[in-house]
C-alpha cells in the first residue's frame, strides 16, 4: 500500500479469482483513543472499533472511503483505491490502446518545435468518475524539471456504438535549449483513477522523435506566363524553431486531382517555392518535415488550382 | 527518404555538401545495422545514449547560432579552445567562435573515425561475418575532415590484445551509430547556418 496523495492510498493486488488479497491496517488521524468506530462509504454499518482497523482487501467491494467517527463526529477519512496486477502486468483498463506507432501505445505525444514544449493525449471510453494527474521529467535517475498543466477533455468522437473521449495535456521543459543533443529521454507519467480503480501509464521519448511541424503557412500560387505551370510559394510555420537556417525544413509538394484515384505528382524541395503543373480541378498541397532528422511530416496545407 | 540530391553551387560554403553526404551515409548505416541486428537491442528505445565526445569537444555550444546565445539554457559550458585555421573558412572573415566551432566538428569526426575503424577491425574477425561498417561512411568522414583541413595530432588506432566479445561489439556499434547520427544532424544544421550567414 502506498499514498497517492493526502488520505488517498493505493492497494496493489495480484488479481486472480480467489486471491488472498492484501491485509491493510488503517489508522484514525486523531489524538482520541476511545470510542472510535469505522464505516465504509455511505453505509452506516460499523466495520470495527478502535484507533486502527484491519481489513483484508480482495476486490473492489473492499475499496472506498473508510471513515473513523466518534460520537457522530467525523475524525478522518482514508480513500482506498485498487491497482490490479494481472499475471505480472499492471492492468490497462481505463485508457484505450491507440496501437500507433505500436501495440500498447496509450499515450501519444507531439512537439511543434525544439523549444521543449510538447503535448500528450490519450483516449478512453469512460465518461464519468474519471480523474487524471500528469507528471514529467527529463531522465528518471536524476530527473530534470518538466512542468505540465492539468489534463483537459479535448475532443469527443463517436466510434460505432461507443463514445470516445480524448484528453490532452501540455508540458514544458523548464530549461530547454533547442539546439541541444538529447541523451536522456523525457518521461511522462499519467495517473488515472476511475471510481476505485487506479492505473498508471508512462511514455518515454526524445523531443527530436516526436517533432511534427505545423503546416507551411501563406501557401500561394502565381501563374507563369504562357504556361500551364504555376509557381507555388509558402513560408515556414510561425511555430517552427528559429533561426530557420539552422532548424531547416524540407517540403513535399503534391498536385492531387479531384478523384483520389488520380495519380499524384510529388516534388521534394528544401526551398520555399516550387514550379508545378496545375491541372483543372486539382489542388496543390505542401507539407513540411525537419530537413535533417526524419520525424513526422506536418499536416498538408492546401490551395485549389483554379 | 529518397529525395533528389542537390548539387552545391560553386560559391557555396565548401563543407555543406560533405556534411549532407555524411548524414545520408550514417543514416543508411544505422538503418542497415538495425535491420541486420534485429535480435540485438539496437533501437533508440533500447540502447544507452552515450556521447564519446562528452567533455572532449563542445560542438553544440561552440556552434550555437547567434540567435540562441541569448538563451541561458544553451550557455552551460563554452570554455573550450581549438586550433583556428581551416579551409572551410576560405575567403571569409570569420570570428574566433566560428573557427572554434569547425575545429570542434573536426575533433568529433576524428574521434568517431578512430572508434569506427577499431570496431570494424573487430567485426572483420567475427566468424558470423554479420555486419561491417560501410566503407562509404568512412570515406565521407574522411572527405569532410579533409574539407575542414585542420592540422591536428593523429590519434593512433586503438588495438586490443584480448579476444573481442562480438555481442558487445555489435551493441557498441549501435550506440556509436545512434550518437554519431545525432552529431551528424548537428553538423548539418551548423553547416546550413554558416552557409546562410
Amino acid at each position: 500500500i502506498w499514498e497517492l496523495k493526502k488520505d488517498v492510498y493505493v492497494v496493489e493486488l495480484d488479481w486472480y479469482p480467489d486471491a488472498p488479497g492484501e491485509m491493510v491496517v488503517l489508522t484514525c488521524d486523531t489524538p482520541e483513543e476511545d470510542g472510535i468506530t469505522w464505516t465504509l462509504d455511505q453505509s452506516s454499518e460499523v466495520l470495527g472499533s478502535g484507533k486502527t482497523l484491519t481489513i483484508q482487501v480482495k476486490e473492489f467491494g473492499d475499496a472506498g472511503q473508510y471513515t473513523c467517527h466518534k460520537g457522530g463526529e467525523v475524525l478522518s477519512h482514508s480513500l482506498l483505491l485498487l491497482h490490479k496486477k494481472e499475471d505480472g502486468i499492471w492492468s490497462t483498463d481505463i485508457l484505450k490502446d491507440q496501437k500507433e506507432p505500436k501495440n500498447k501505445t496509450f499515450l501519444r505525444c507531439e512537439a511543434k518545435n525544439y523549444s521543449g514544449r510538447f503535448t500528450c493525449w490519450w483516449l478512453t471510453t469512460i465518461s464519468t468518475d474519471l480523474t487524471f494527474s500528469v507528471k514529467s521529467s527529463r531522465g528518471s535517475s536524476d530527473p530534470q524539471g518538466v512542468t505540465c498543466g492539468a489534463a483537459t477533455l479535448s475532443a469527443e468522437r463517436v466510434r460505432g456504438d461507443n463514445k470516445e473521449y480524448e484528453y490532452s495535456v501540455e508540458c514544458q521543459e523548464d530549461s530547454a535549449c533547442p539546439a541541444a543533443e538529447e541523451s536522456l529521454p523525457i518521461e511522462v507519467m499519467v495517473d488515472a483513477v476511475h471510481k476505485l480503480k487506479y492505473e498508471n501509464y508512462t511514455s518515454s521519448f526524445f523531443i527530436r522523435d516526436i517533432i511534427k511541424p505545423d503546416p507551411p503557412k501563406n501557401l500561394q500560387l502565381k501563374p507563369l506566363k504562357n504556361s500551364r505551370q504555376v509557381e507555388v510559394s509558402w513560408e515556414y510555420p510561425d511555430t517552427w524553431s528559429t533561426p530557420h537556417s539552422y532548424f531547416s525544413l524540407t517540403f513535399c509538394v503534391q498536385v492531387q486531382g479531384k478523384s483520389k484515384r488520380e495519380k499524384k505528382d510529388r516534388v521534394f524541395t528544401d526551398k520555399t517555392s516550387a514550379t508545378v503543373i496545375c491541372r483543372k480541378n486539382a489542388s496543390i498541397s505542401v507539407r513540411a518535415q525537419d530537413r535533417y532528422y526524419s520525424s513526422s511530416w506536418s499536416e498538408w496545407a492546401s490551395v485549389p488550382c483554379s | 527518404r529518397n529525395l533528389p540530391v542537390a548539387t552545391p553551387d560553386p560559391g557555396m560554403f565548401p563543407c555543406l555538401h560533405h556534411s549532407q553526404n555524411l548524414l545520408r551515409a550514417v543514416s543508411n548505416m544505422l538503418q542497415k545495422a538495425r535491420q541486420t541486428l534485429e535480435f540485438y537491442p539496437c533501437t533508440s528505445e533500447e540502447i544507452d545514449h552515450e556521447d564519446i565526445t562528452k567533455d572532449k569537444t563542445s560542438t553544440v555550444e561552440a556552434c550555437l547560432p547567434l540567435e540562441l546565445t541569448k538563451n541561458e539554457s544553451c550557455l552551460n559550458s563554452r570554455e573550450t579552445s581549438f586550433i583556428t585555421n581551416g579551409s572551410c573558412l576560405a575567403s571569409r572573415k570569420t570570428s574566433f567562435m566560428m573557427a572554434l566551432c569547425l575545429s570542434s566538428i573536426y575533433e568529433d569526426l576524428k574521434m568517431y573515425q578512430v572508434e569506427f575503424k577499431t570496431m570494424n577491425a573487430k567485426l572483420l574477425m567475427d566468424p558470423k561475418r554479420q555486419i561491417f561498417l560501410d566503407q562509404n561512411m568512412l570515406a565521407v568522414i574522411d572527405e569532410l575532415m579533409q574539407a575542414l583541413n585542420f592540422n591536428s595530432e593523429t590519434v593512433p588506432q586503438k588495438s586490443s590484445l584480448e579476444e573481442p566479445d562480438f555481442y558487445k561489439t555489435k551493441i557498441k556499434l549501435c550506440i556509436l551509430l545512434h550518437a554519431f547520427r545525432i552529431r551528424a544532424v548537428t553538423i548539418d544544421r551548423v553547416m546550413s547556418y554558416l552557409n546562410a550567414s
Epitope: 495480484d14 479469482p17 494481472e86 499475471d87 505480472g88 502486468i89 483498463d93 490502446d97 500498447k104 | 537491442p41
Partner: antibody, heavy 115, light 112 residues
Framework: QVQLVQSGGGVVQPGRSLRLSCAAS????????MHWVRQAPGKGLEWVAF????????YYADSVKGRFTISRDNSKNTLYLQMKSLRAEDTAVYYC????????WGQGTMVTVSS | SYVLTQPPSVSGTPGQRVTISCSGG????????VKWYQQLPGTAPKLLIY???QRPSGVPDRFSGSKSGTSASLAITGVQAEDEADYYC????????????FGTGTKVTVLG
C-alpha cells in the same frame, strides 16, 4: 471454490460451426479476463483467444482470427467460443482458463472436425 | 505457432536433479513473467510456477523456476516417479496480456 465447467464439444464436419460454453462459479466472474487454450491430440498447448473482464477487448491467435469469436455473458457467468468454418486442424481438446498469476482451468472439451 | 522452445524430452533417475530449458526472445521472456505447468495424461495442465520463480501453495518445493535474459528454466531437485509428465513454459508476447505463448513441451521420464 473456483469452478469452470465446460460443454458443447463434439464431432463436426469441416466448414461447419460449433459453440463451446464455460460456466464459472465460486468467484466474481465479471471481474476477470478469460482465455481459451487448445491442445491437439499428442501435441502441445496453443493459446486461442482472450477476452477482457468487461468484454471490451478481444484478442485471437492468428490461426483462428476471423473464424472464431470469444464472448461472455457476465449476467450468466458464462464464457463462449463460437467456432465457424472449422478445419481438420482445429481438432483438439479446448480448455477455458481464468486470467491471472494463478489460473484455473476447465476440465476440457473435445472438438473433432472430421468428414 | 510456438514461440518458446523446449527440449522434447529429458530423463533422470529418482533423486536426481532434472532441468528443463525454455528459450524465447526479447518480445516475450525478456519483457514478461514466465509460468510452468505440469500436465499428466488425460488431465488439464496444473500450475507449478508463476512470476518466473514463485510456487503456488501446494506445489512441492523440489520444483523451482528461474529466468535469465531470453530464457527460463524449471528445475526438479530429487525427481520422483510421480513427476513423470509433460511440462510447458508460458509467457506473454510484447507485454500484451491477451496473447499467451506456450513452449513446445517437454516429456519428463523417470527411469528405474
Amino acid at each position: 471454490q473456483v469452478q469452470l465447467v465446460q460443454s458443447g464439444g463434439g464431432v463436426v464436419q469441416p466448414g461447419r460451426s460449433l459453440r463451446l460454453s464455460c460456466a464459472a462459479s465460486g468467484f466474481t466472474f465479471s471481474s476477470y479476463g478469460m482465455h481459451w487454450v487448445r491442445q491437439a491430440p499428442g501435441k502441445g498447448l496453443e493459446w486461442v483467444a482472450f477476452i477482457r473482464y468487461d468484454g471490451s477487448n478481444k484478442y485471437y491467435a492468428d490461426s483462428v482470427k476471423g473464424r472464431f469469436t470469444i464472448s461472455r455473458d457476465n449476467s450468466k457467468n458464462t464464457l463462449y467460443l463460437q467456432m465457424k468454418s472449422l478445419r481438420a486442424e482445429d481438432t483438439a481438446v479446448y480448455y477455458c482458463t481464468t486470467h491471472g498469476s494463478h489460473d484455473n482451468w476447465g476440465q476440457g472439451t473435445m472438438v473433432t472436425v472430421s468428414s | 505457432s510456438y514461440v518458446l522452445t523446449q527440449p522434447p524430452s529429458v530423463s533422470g533417475t529418482p533423486g536426481q536433479r532434472v532441468t528443463i530449458s525454455c528459450s524465447g526472445g526479447r518480445s516475450n521472456i525478456v519483457s514478461n513473467t514466465v509460468k510452468w505447468y505440469q500436465q499428466l495424461p488425460g488431465t488439464a495442465p496444473k500450475l507449478l510456477i508463476y512470476g518466473n520463480d514463485q510456487r503456488p501453495s501446494g506445489v512441492p518445493d523440489r520444483f523451482s523456476g528461474s529466468k535469465s535474459g531470453t530464457s527460463a528454466s524449471l528445475a526438479i531437485t530429487g525427481v520422483q516417479a510421480e513427476d513423470e509428465a509433460d511440462y510447458y513454459c508460458q509467457s506473454y508476447d510484447r507485454g500484451f496480456t491477451g496473447s499467451r505463448v506456450f513452449g513446445t513441451g517437454t516429456k519428463v521420464t523417470v527411469l528405474g
